[in-house]
């Protein structure tokens, strides 16, 4: 899960609903910084690279992150 930060917050709206991992191009966890005081989780979808912001406090999103991390660790040697 790549970490990055633009020079401002990105998310206009946030979703409590997890996205289908199969539809995911990438998932970014962007830590709070001097530029944006909140953690942002941005799911980039395969369709046209659309981005959906996910609520870091949502239980469903936390479960999604666990699932994605698990999948990644399975794939790494």
């Amino acid at each position: 899960v790549p970490l990055s930060r633009t020079v401002r917050c990105t998310c206009i709206s946030i979703s409590n609903q997890p996205v289908n991992p199969r539809s995911l191009e990438k998932l970014e966890i962007i830590p709070a910084s001097q530029f944006c005081p909140r953690v942002e989780i941005i799911a980039t979808m395969k369709k046209k690279g659309e981005k959906r912001c996910l609520n870091p406090e949502s239980k469903a999103i936390k479960n999604l992150l666990k699932a994605v991390s698990k999948e990644r660790s399975k794939r790494s040697p």
Epitope: S13, S15, I42, C53
Partner: antibody, heavy 121, light 108 residues
Framework: QVQLVESGGGVVQPGRSLRLSCAAS????????MHWVRQAPGKGLEWVAV????????YYADSVKGRFTISRDNSRNTLYLQMNSLRPEDTAVYYC??????????????WGQGTMVTVSS | SYVLTQPPSVSVAPGKTARITCGGN??????VHWYQQKPGQAPVLVIY???DRPSGIPERFSGSNSGNTATLTISRVEAGDEADYYC???????????FGGGTKVTVL
Amino acid sequence: QVQLVESGGGVVQPGRSLRLSCAASGFTFSSYGMHWVRQAPGKGLEWVAVISYDGSIKYYADSVKGRFTISRDNSRNTLYLQMNSLRPEDTAVYYCAKDWGFSGSLTFDYWGQGTMVTVSS
Amino acid sequence: SYVLTQPPSVSVAPGKTARITCGGNNIGSKSVHWYQQKPGQAPVLVIYYDSDRPSGIPERFSGSNSGNTATLTISRVEAGDEADYYCQVWDSSSDHVVFGGGTKVTVL
């Protein structure tokens, strides 16, 4: 169901101020960005401003930047537009609109019925 | 800033197909959304992300987007489709929402 109800419109003299409100219900207000869009009589739609779900991001159209301020009170499920230094060309129906929820391309999935603002001496 | 160009009007006979274009520089790289507005009413989202339809919008409404032109197609046009139609994009380079000038669809 989603409901957006604007209020605060009226007739005001050039140079004066007005504050519009939009009462929201039927969805988790604190999770969604909100917009103001206006439409001058007989003209097309013009986007005015957007505010993020927590109020940390605000973007404005060039035509209102420095004069209008968008804000929100998530505890009251209410969106505001403070309009200062009003001009005759600000005369329009002002709609509040809910953002669809994708950050990559802002979209309006629900609209209020609008409130009329007339700036005239 | 980014500009979207629509024809001011389109006329179509009932039962025929209406095509409304929305031109913009490399618009195919952006997501285009379409709204229908009837007189005295608020706009209604009819197509989002180029070609997706919100629930409750008839299948007669479809969209496409490539190159410098996005198109809203209304098949088997009905009298109730008479309205103004607006295309819209988010211009991330300027952080502005941009609307086209609108197209008045008249059903003959």
